[in-house]
Amino acid sequence: AVNGTSQFTCFYNSRANISCVWSQDGALQDTSCQVHAWPDRRRWNQTCELLPVSQASWACNLILGAPDSQKLTTVDIVTLRVLCREGVRWRVMAIQDFKPFENLRLMAPISLQVVHVETHRCNISWEISQASHYFERHLEFEARTLSPGHTWEEAPLLTLKQKQEWICLETLTPDTQYEFQVRVKPLQGEFTTWSPWSQPLAFRTKPAALGKDT
């Protein structure tokens, strides 16, 4: 049995994935739970098994089709339900009418690489993954660089207000190890949020030439 409040949050990656997190304050005994997606105007429906991510929250990914297929539009409404097994039947624990393009969170950027590195500068590029063609080039990015002795939270955010899949980091210290991350967000959607941060890219600036004033 379940008591307490629950929170059920889902995001659409703009192509063929809806990721959901269900949080439940009360005690949940060993039971099987799943998310069920039922679109109002599509012939398919989809289910995923909720797996624990912490003591009181569970997550799963609804895979709607091939990663780059456009499975939903702005007029789709998907009824999302959390169902938990109670004996021989399923009990509805949470429900929402989900508007995919009001609840966007893109996949984290991928394929980060150092294009060119110098003593004080580093040019880095990346790619976006599974972003809808509807956005065309209209995306924004945030980037951050981890310097020695600092935390990610202390790193200043660099904002790129257009679909620019590269950055030139300046005023770096020679012969120093850095890490870099980037995230992406579309312009559309009342509840749209930033993608997760990319996997960090580690790089090292070149040492200053001997005998030269730096």
């Epitope: 105007r41 599509r42 499975k71 539009t73 007029v75 789709d76 393009f101 509807y134 065309e136």
Partner: nanobody, 119 residues
Framework: QVQLVESGGGLVQTGGSLRLSCAVS????????MGWYRQVPGKQRELVAD???????KYADSVKGRFSILRDSVKNTVYLQMSSLKPEDTGIYYC?????????????WGQGTQVTVSS
């Protein structure tokens, strides 16, 4: 500037047929849904039929089996084939297009075309 141009309305007898068409033109856009709504005096505009990307069509219960919607994504045109028309199908038929422009989605409407079904 986006423009929706409707055509094909007119006066027809009960049991007759009409074909409406609506073409979208103008600035750079991507359409993800196009459809038809109708309005009768004293009532709100209501969905007749629409078609979203992926070929997903939606029809009002009152027109199922009589009307069919066809969308040509290359020409950015939507058609409504209306058959077995009834007097209660009379109204102003409006075309609606959901368009992505510069990364944001908005709905655009045509001026409307009158359909009158006489008994």
């Amino acid at each position: 500037q986006v423009q929706l141009v409707e055509s094909g309305g007119g006066l027809v007898q009960t049991g007759g047929s009409l074909r409406l068409s609506c073409a979208v033109s103008g600035s750079r856009f991507i359409s993800d849904v196009m459809g038809w709504y109708r309005q009768v005096p004293g009532k709100q505009r209501e969905l007749v039929a629409d078609m979203a990307d992926g070929g997903s069509a939606k029809y009002a219960d009152s027109v199922k089996g009589r009307f069919s919607i066809l969308r040509d994504s290359v020409k950015n045109t939507v058609y409504l084939q209306m058959s077995s028309l009834k007097p209660e199908d009379t109204g102003i038929y409006y075309c609606k297009a959901g368009l992505w422009i510069a990364g944001r989605h908005s709905d655009y409407w045509g001026q409307g075309t009158q359909v009158t079904v006489s008994s």
